[in-house]
């Protein structure tokens, strides 16, 4: 049975040319996340993979960053991402839960809210810890 | 300029064991994960499992889980799988093929490694 | 597991033609797809990743198109040395899943 739940950050609304992070989270169940799969409407984002690391599609590849965690940083917003997105998380036993994230892409100078997100630098303590640059897998 | 580079080929009795190498040079061994697929009578592909050089981390198709193991030798940029309890159902060509910068498919394969299972 | 079908197992044509391979997928892979070129005796070579992006070097009669189940790769003109097996593989989901190949053979 499954009794996970997908906790995602809902609506949000954030500036063009700015950045946002996508996050969800799954709680209430003791499956294992083997990978999540990030999706906008029709159009694969991003895979993340628990041993395998990240894919990141080839038509987002200059704007969208992996992570934090699970997450991804959709950076260089326009107007045309404004949308559902879905975090599609494969699990074993339980199987797939999905996440459903809606992002308004605002022309304004303020955004409601989910606004101006800080991009993770990339330091790290040492290459160990440094993500791979291949199918972006971490250690 | 990238290279996989596997071991000879072998020739195995059933119910033992073989163990393929895959040296790499060209690039940062541990910044790309390993994937290994078995080819058996010239056509059909099918996906052993991958590692992850940096941290060993391994997924395996379920297929296979259990009978191969992935390891990897940082120090000699080296990928090895291994295969137990042989059949003859496991004489293939076996490669190891590398993915790209962050996208999972296979841009570099090793020359393949031929197996037989013969009594 | 994906299932990923080819439904030519081969397939005959000849210089100069254009030639549609097709793969199908069990379940929705989304753009997850790539398409390898292997010739006889040699190892699969990358030509087209994400469903449509052909790979570095690639000649650009080479295409793939498609999104969710259905998949084409197309050569848009037949060279002679098109000659070979091609694979389409989903890495949607692991097990990452292969077709069972279609071999274009030239008339």
């Known amino acids: 049975m499954m009794t996970g739940t997908i906790e995602t950050t809902g609506n949000i609304s954030a500036e063009k040319g700015g950045s946002i992070i996508l996050q969800c989270h799954l709680s209430s169940t003791t499956a294992q996340v083997t990978q999540v799969n990030w999706e906008q409407q029709d159009q694969l984002l991003a895979i993340c993979n628990a041993d395998l690391g990240w894919h990141i599609s080839p038509s987002f590849k200059d704007r969208v960053a992996p992570g934090p965690g699970l997450g991804l940083t959709l950076q260089s917003l326009t107007v045309n991402d404004t949308g559902e997105y879905f975090c599609i998380y494969h699990t074993y036993p339980d199987g797939t839960y999905t996440g459903r994230i809606f992002l308004e892409v605002l022309e304004s100078s303020v955004a409601e809210h989910g606004a101006r997100f800080q991009i993770p630098t990339g330091d790290y303590k040492d290459d160990d810890d440094k993500p791979n640059k291949g199918s972006g897998t971490t250690s | 300029e990238v290279q996989l580079q596997q071991s000879g080929p072998e020739l195995v009795k059933p119910g033992a064991s073989v163990k393929i190498s895959c040296k790499t040079s060209?690039?940062?061994?541990?910044?790309?994960?390993m994937h290994w697929v078995k080819q058996s009578h010239g056509k059909n592909l099918e996906w052993i499992g991958g590692?992850?050089?940096?941290?060993?981390?391994?997924s395996y198709n379920q297929k296979f889980k259990g009978r191969a193991t992935l390891t990897v030798d940082k120090s000699s940029s080296t990928a090895y799988m291994e295969l137990r309890s042989l059949t003859s159902d496991d004489s293939a060509v076996y490669y190891c093929?590398?993915?790209?910068?962050?996208?999972?498919?296979?841009?570099?394969w090793g020359q393949g490694t031929s197996v037989t299972v013969s009594s | 597991d994906i299932v990923m079908t080819q439904s030519h197992k081969f397939m005959s044509t000849s210089v100069g033609d254009r030639v549609n391979i097709t793969c199908k997928a069990s379940?929705?892979?989304?753009?997850?797809v790539a398409w390898y070129q292997q010739k006889p005796g040699q190892s699969p070579k990358l030509l087209i990743y994400?469903?449509?992006y052909r790979y570095t070097g690639v000649p650009d009669r080479f295409t793939g198109s498609g999104s969710g189940t259905d998949f084409t790769f197309t050569i848009s003109s037949v060279q002679a040395e098109d000659l070979a097996v091609y694979h389409c593989?989903?890495?949607?989901?692991?097990?990452?899943?292969f077709g069972g190949g279609t071999k274009l053979e030239i008339k």
């Open positions: 593989q989903q890495h949607y989901i692991t097990p990452w899943t």
């Open positions: 994400s469903a449509s």
């Open positions: 060209g690039y940062t061994f541990t910044e790309y994960t």
């Open positions: 379940q929705g892979v989304s753009t997850a």
């Open positions: 590692i992850n050089p940096n941290n060993g981390g391994t």
């Open positions: 093929a590398r993915p790209g910068w962050y996208n999972y498919a296979m841009d570099y």
